[in-house]
Amino acid sequence: TCEIVTLDRDSSQPRRTIARQTARCACRKGQIAGTTRARPACVDARIIKTKQWCDMLPCLEGEGCDLLINRSGWTCTQPGGRIKTTTVS
């Protein structure tokens, strides 16, 4: 299964949690560790190469996915309007 290594979590700011997470997955040829439905998963390597992050389907069902400026990551927008932002480094 995919192994999650949480490197850092910062909850000092109200209503905001910053976490840095790395996932390691045993993937098939042509795939690489990514995020699907908010879970670590093997995704097509072309998604990572082109930075079309929403093509991983990273958000939960019922949410909307949008790319950040410069394709530096993505946002998941919940039906109520709350936004979760993920940046890729």
């Epitope: 098939r28 560790a33 097509d44 929403c54 389907l57």
Partner: antibody
Framework: SLEESGGRLVTPGTPLTLTCTAS????????MGWVRQAPGEGLEWIGI?????STYYASWAKGRFTISKTSTTVDLKMTSLTTEDTATYFC???????????????????WGQGTLVTVSS | ELDMTQTPPSLSASVGETVRIRCLAS??????ISWYQQKPGKPPTLLIY???NLESGVPPRFSGSGSGTDYTLTIGGVQAEDAATYYC??????????FGAGTNVEIK
């Protein structure tokens, strides 16, 4: 839900665009596909459009079929239609299920009722 | 391009019997197969994905198995309402995707 529209009787060579209207979910968070079924025959894969708008087509459909989308609709544009294109055309929502080892699998988990295209002279 | 060979094309079974439908892929698809049921005049419905994962709401008499190129859909204790045509769909959305030819299941 998904609802296809635009199917009708056309003559060979006539272009036609089918529309799939999605409601209750965001197209930005799913892939969408088109599948067709000739009368009395099996299901035939046409192509897919990803969240980003990138597309992939079955080899037989390349060049004649084009898939595009807006925030709430997915279109299938068909050109150079022949009698062999007579079929019910379905759109389907494609979700990804994550299984063992983090491997991801396609799930065509929501289908429209289909729209009938008849090509006849 | 990926080819999915589905057998048998049709079968007849009595209520309570076990039914098996096989799909053979032309290349290793790494469990990238899903199974669908279609009744006349209706769209298909998802039964199994990822070779063996049961879709929510599907009766547990349906199961899937296999790996590599060889996959099977099993209906254990078939019921009258299972009369339908069943299709496998093999491959991946970022590569080649192909349906099997279908298996028509008749209940005696």
């Amino acid at each position: 839900s998904l609802e296809e529209s635009g199917g009708r009787l056309v003559t060979p060579g006539t272009p036609l665009t089918l529309t799939c209207t999605a409601s209750g979910f965001s197209l930005s968070n799913y892939y969408m596909g088109w599948v067709r079924q000739a009368p009395g025959e099996g299901l035939e894969w046409i192509g897919i459009i990803y969240a980003s708008g990138s597309t992939y087509y079955a080899s037989w459909a390349k060049g004649r079929f084009t898939i595009s989308k807006t925030s709430t609709t997915v279109d299938l544009k068909m050109t150079s239609l022949t009698t062999e294109d007579t079929a019910t055309y379905f759109c389907a929502r494609i979700d990804i299920g994550v299984g063992d080892y983090g491997w991801a699998y396609d799930r065509l988990d929501l289908w429209g009722q289909g729209t009938l295209v008849t090509v006849s002279s | 391009e990926l080819d999915m060979t589905q057998t048998p094309p049709s079968l007849s079974a009595s209520v309570g019997e076990t039914v098996r439908i096989r799909c053979l892929a032309s290349e290793d698809i790494y469990s990238g197969i899903s199974w669908y049921q279609q009744k006349p005049g209706k769209p298909p419905t998802l039964l199994i994905y990822g070779a063996s994962n049961l879709e929510s709401g599907v009766p547990p008499r349906f199961s899937g198995s296999g790996s590599g190129t060889d996959y099977t859909l099993t209906i254990g204790g078939v019921q009258a309402e299972d009369a339908a045509t069943y299709y496998c769909l093999g491959g991946y959305s970022y590569s080649s995707i192909t349906f099997g030819a279908g298996t028509n299941v008749e209940i005696k």
